[in-house]
């Protein structure tokens, strides 16, 4: 039986269950390779309060559809009197990277989990040439997610003080130029992450191959090494290589940019201090509100919440969007889909759609950005699940009694973006992270 | 490829105001980064100030800060260039530009470009 999702098959993954501290290995075309859990298992739990491994799926006993992957075990589990088996139940859905598998929960007999990647898509628009997985869990367990970084088209510069090159990075895949024919960063040779551009040439100095690691608590790590033979005649005979060192700061503080600390016979270092290297409860939250010891901030934007029915209207040319945050409130127009973002045509009001809803809600402080991010709407022809993402800004004074109003600012293969001027975006910090 | 046009130059007397504004039409992704830059005669094409499209953070060349302000209005699509205090020494066309590159004031990285509006500052 072929792979279902070959693209995430060179990689052993990992999921956290914080909760009761578990650690799960996970790899979806082979075996995890841990003695513990046996030579077949696809799917190893590691308990760290008992210290001991189980293995929770088979990677022998795989039954696979386009969006769910089952791994059985021949161990039985007691659940209701019924004699079932222990499983794993992981289930896909499209995203725009690679993405991560999440643990949702386990019974007795079941651990779930769920998957937003770009392997589980029905078109390959999202399809990058080579990326690798992007997030990392340190030894207290604690997620650091740079998938937020990562961007689909374009790349940053690296701040460098030689004039005559400029040194562009994506991070943790590709730099894709389609969307920008006109800049210098078009001549970087495909599958590139790391283009040297010097005049009008550019060179493909470093592809990504291992995924990010953790070399130490708020300090990660990611290497790219150009894999065709061939030295370029400006490297002394060696071969090019990138290592971006991602630095969580000891304080919030706005993003600041890539920088080159050290370059030598092609072989070049960035350090590149951002929030997004710190673990991944300090910038979110799965509520309208970050505060408290954890995350250096207060924030609440619950205030914005709509009752009596009554939504935000945002227009968007050809659509109007129905906006109700930070709630569990019904948009009337949405058709009972809980949806926290509804777009509804224009021409066409009976055509409906959920932009995200409001069991699927992110709010992300980040680099001195701060993010309301709804998900799982309804499908858009490529499988993505339609989402919006609402850019915050600090207005004290803005209309609608410092409420203001979001304004829709445009669309991007179905994820729909608005910023928001409101003073309940103002955040007030505290300092002793 | 987003399609732009610059429009509110003219001329204006030394320590006088002008507001230039920037309208992009076509697929206008929030993943650009938008920039104004500027070219005297004889002079190489310079940057003056960019915003990011999905935040307001901004950037300004040391020679315009304090007296020009970048915004933008994403319900209109349009990025301003508000220029207070000129100096004749501001005299150019003025160019809108749009890029996918992050952290960037090189005009080499900006792909898409207005046609320009020129700008003169008379002493």
């Known amino acids: 039986q072929a792979a279902p999702f070959p693209e995430l098959c060179s990689y052993t993954w990992e999921a956290v269950d914080t909760k009761n501290n578990v650690l799960y290995k996970i790899n979806i075309c082979g075996s995890v390779d841990i003695v513990q859990c046996g030579p077949s298992s696809a799917v190893c739990m590691h308990d760290l309060k008992t210290r001991t491994y189980h293995s929770v799926g088979d990677s022998v006993l795989r039954s696979a559809t386009r969006s769910l992957l089952e791994f059985n075990t021949t161990v039985s589990c007691d659940q209701q009197g019924t004699n079932h088996r222990v499983q794993s139940s992981i289930a896909f859905l499209c995203g725009k990277t690679l993405g991560t598998p999440e643990f949702v929960t386990a019974t007795e007999c079941v651990h779930y989990f769920e998957w937003r990647t770009t392997a589980a898509c029905k078109k390959d628009i999202f399809k990058a040439n080579k990326e690798v997985p992007c997030y990392v869990f340190d030894e207290e367990l604690r997620k650091h997610d740079l998938n937020p970084l990562i961007k689909l088209s374009g790349a940053y510069l690296v701040d460098d003080s030689d004039p005559d090159t400029s040194l562009f990075i994506n991070v943790c895949r590709d730099i894709d130029t389609l969307r920008d024919p006109g800049s210098q960063l078009r001549a970087c040779p495909p599958g590139t992450a790391a283009c040297l551009v010097r005049g009008h040439q550019a060179f493909d100095v470093g592809q990504p191959r291992d995924g990010l690691k953790v070399v130490r608590k708020d300090r990660l790590v990611l290497s790219y090494v150009r894999e065709e033979a061939g030295k370029l005649d400006f490297c002394d005979g060696h071969s090019p290589a990138v290592t971006i060192t991602f630095v969580c700061p000891s304080e919030r503080r706005e993003g600041t940019i890539p920088k080159l600390t050290a370059k030598s016979n092609c072989r070049y270092e960035i350090e590149w201090i951002t929030e997004y290297a710190c673990h991944r409860d300090y910038l979110e939250s799965k509520t309208c509100s970050l505060s408290g010891e954890q995350q250096d901030v207060s924030i609440d934007l619950t205030p914005l919440a709509q009752s009596g029915g009554s939504s935000y209207i945002s227009d968007g040319k050809e659509y109007l969007f129905y906006l109700n945050v930070c709630g569990e409130t019904e948009i009337q127009f949405c058709n009972k889909k809980q949806a926290a973002v509804c777009q509804v045509k224009k021409s066409d009001t009976s055509q409906v759609k959920a932009a995200g809803r409001y069991h699927n809600q992110t709010l992300r402080y980040s680099d001195g950005d701060l993010t309301l991010i709804y998900f799982g709407g309804d499908e858009c022809s490529s499988g993505f699940q339609r989402m919006s993402v609402i850019n915050f800004e600090c207005n004290k004074t803005a209309g609608n009694d410092g409420k203001g109003t979001p304004v829709f600012t445009g669309e991007v293969d179905c994820t729909y973006e608005f910023t928001w001027d409101t003073e309940y975006a103002c955040v007030h910090h505290h300092h002793h992270h | 490829q987003v399609q732009l046009q610059e429009s509110g130059g003219g001329l204006v007397q030394a320590g006088g105001s002008l507001r230039l504004s920037c309208e992009a039409s076509g697929r206008t992704f929030n993943t650009y980064n938008w920039g104004w830059f500027r070219q005297a005669p004889g002079k190489e094409r310079e940057f003056v100030a960019a915003?990011?499209?999905?935040?307001?953070?901004?950037s300004y060349a040391d020679s315009v800060k304090g007296r020009f302000t970048i915004s933008r209005d994403n319900a209109k699509n349009t990025i301003y260039l508000q220029m207070n205090s000129l100096k004749p020494e501001d005299t150019a066309v003025y160019y809108c530009?749009?890029?996918?590159?992050?952290?960037?004031?090189?005009?080499?990285?900006?792909?898409?470009w207005g046609q320009g509006t020129q700008v003169t500052v008379s002493s």
């Open positions: 915003i990011r499209w999905s935040s307001s953070k901004t």
């Open positions: 530009a749009a890029s996918i590159v992050d952290f960037t004031t090189n005009p080499s990285h900006f792909g898409s």
